[in-house]
Amino acid sequence: APVLPGEDSKDVAAPHSQPLTSSERIDKHIRYILDGISALRKETCNRSNMCESSKEALAENNLNLPKMAEKDGCFQSGFNEDTCLVKIITGLLEFEVYLEYLQNRFESSEEQARAVQMSTKVLIQFLQKKAKNLDAITTPEPTTNASLLTKLQAQNQWLQDMTTHLILRSFKEFLQSSLRALRQM
């Protein structure tokens, strides 16, 4: 079974070594989640031809997946530490419903999907501790999430496969941008 960062022998601190700092924990968690996404993408791509599909734009219009934009202050030009951190946390909170959707979408990688979801929850907690401006962070409404989940699960098989592919791809891009930005914080 996949192991969360800090649980495997490589991460267990030797008796006299210090525990991971908050930045180290965040960095390790993001890289761990990215590894998980790679494994999930592998299964998705092996199972269907979605990874080569040219019809992505069609399905993407129906999804409102979090994306980094210039105004979020996470890119090299116009970088803003506070604004960006709020965007990263808000984006991760918005991704949670999509990660919930992924839970029943995998056969051989079922545990990996659960580990990505759980590790994302832990990552959000670490980032919230780091953020000063918590007031600016908006949490999605549970009712909105519930109806979105129902809608996604009611799609036909092709759209569900496409949705799975798009969620993984978008989440990977979001985390990679987050990782780059966090390294200037």
Epitope: Q18, L20, T21, E24, S77, E81, D82, R180, Q184, M185
Partner: antibody, heavy 120, light 111 residues
């Protein structure tokens, strides 16, 4: 063209203070974490301090903790190092350095350095 | 004494290959892929060559390459040229949000 120009170095007595400045140009200063690295005469490099892009987080080498303070003014594109309780072993060339974007712990640009001499 | 151990000097003839080692611990070199290498020509500020263990910085010739095995990193310079004569420093992230450097290695290009 990226430029980092240090100033404020000089001769100071043990126990004294100095404030180093680094004027940055040719890039969006507020987007980058910055550091100070020093080099004692004829010796190797030693990392001194780091500050995040927005100035929220700061880190220090044990050898300067409690004596040196790193800060920045993004409106003026300037990095600072306030050095108090200076010791002879602080004598070195102090370099202002920029962290590579999106890379953890690597310096892609260095200033030419400013000499600090602590002696009675 | 420096936190990372480098040989004080290495030498090689033009056109040949030299390797500079940088030994650390599991808390720095062995912790992640956070090793970088810098070249310092006499009287000049250091210049980045390699970051993240093996990625070449912009504008750096492919004669320079980096690698890592366990707690030891290495910089390899192939096709040695006279202008490569300089001091070379390795640096690594160390657990606890700090950076440590090696003591530096002076490369002499013979002949």
């Amino acid at each position: 063209e990226v430029q980092l120009v240090e100033s404020g170095g000089g001769l100071v007595q043990p126990g004294g203070s100095l404030r180093l400045s680094c004027a940055a140009s040719g890039f969006t200063f507020s987007s980058y974490a910055m550091s100070w690295v020093r080099q004692a005469p004829g010796k190797g490099l030693e990392w001194v301090s780091r500050i995040s892009s927005g100035g929220i987080s700061t880190y220090y080498a044990d050898s300067v903790k409690g004596r040196f303070t790193i800060s920045r003014d993004n409106a003026k594109n300037t990095l600072y190092l306030q050095m108090n309780s200076l010791k002879p072993e602080d004598t070195a060339v102090y370099y202002c350095v920029r962290y590579a974007w999106g890379v953890q712990w690597a310096f892609d640009f260095w200033g030419q350095g400013t000499q600090v001499t602590v002696s009675s | 004494s420096y936190d990372l151990t480098q040989p004080p000097s290495v030498s090689g003839s033009p056109g040949k290959t030299v390797t500079i080692s940088c030994a650390g611990t599991s808390s720095d070199v062995g912790y992640g892929n956070y090793v970088s290498w810098y070249q310092q020509l006499p009287g000049m500020a250091p210049k980045i060559l390699i970051y993240d263990v093996n990625k070449r910085a912009s504008g750096i010739a492919d004669r320079f390459s980096g690698s890592k095995s366990g707690n030891t990193a290495s910089l390899t310079i192939s096709g040695l040229q006279s202008e490569d004569e300089a001091d070379y420093y390795c640096a690594s992230y160390r657990r606890g949000e700090t950076i440590v450097f090696g003591g530096g290695t002076h490369l002499t290009v013979l002949g």
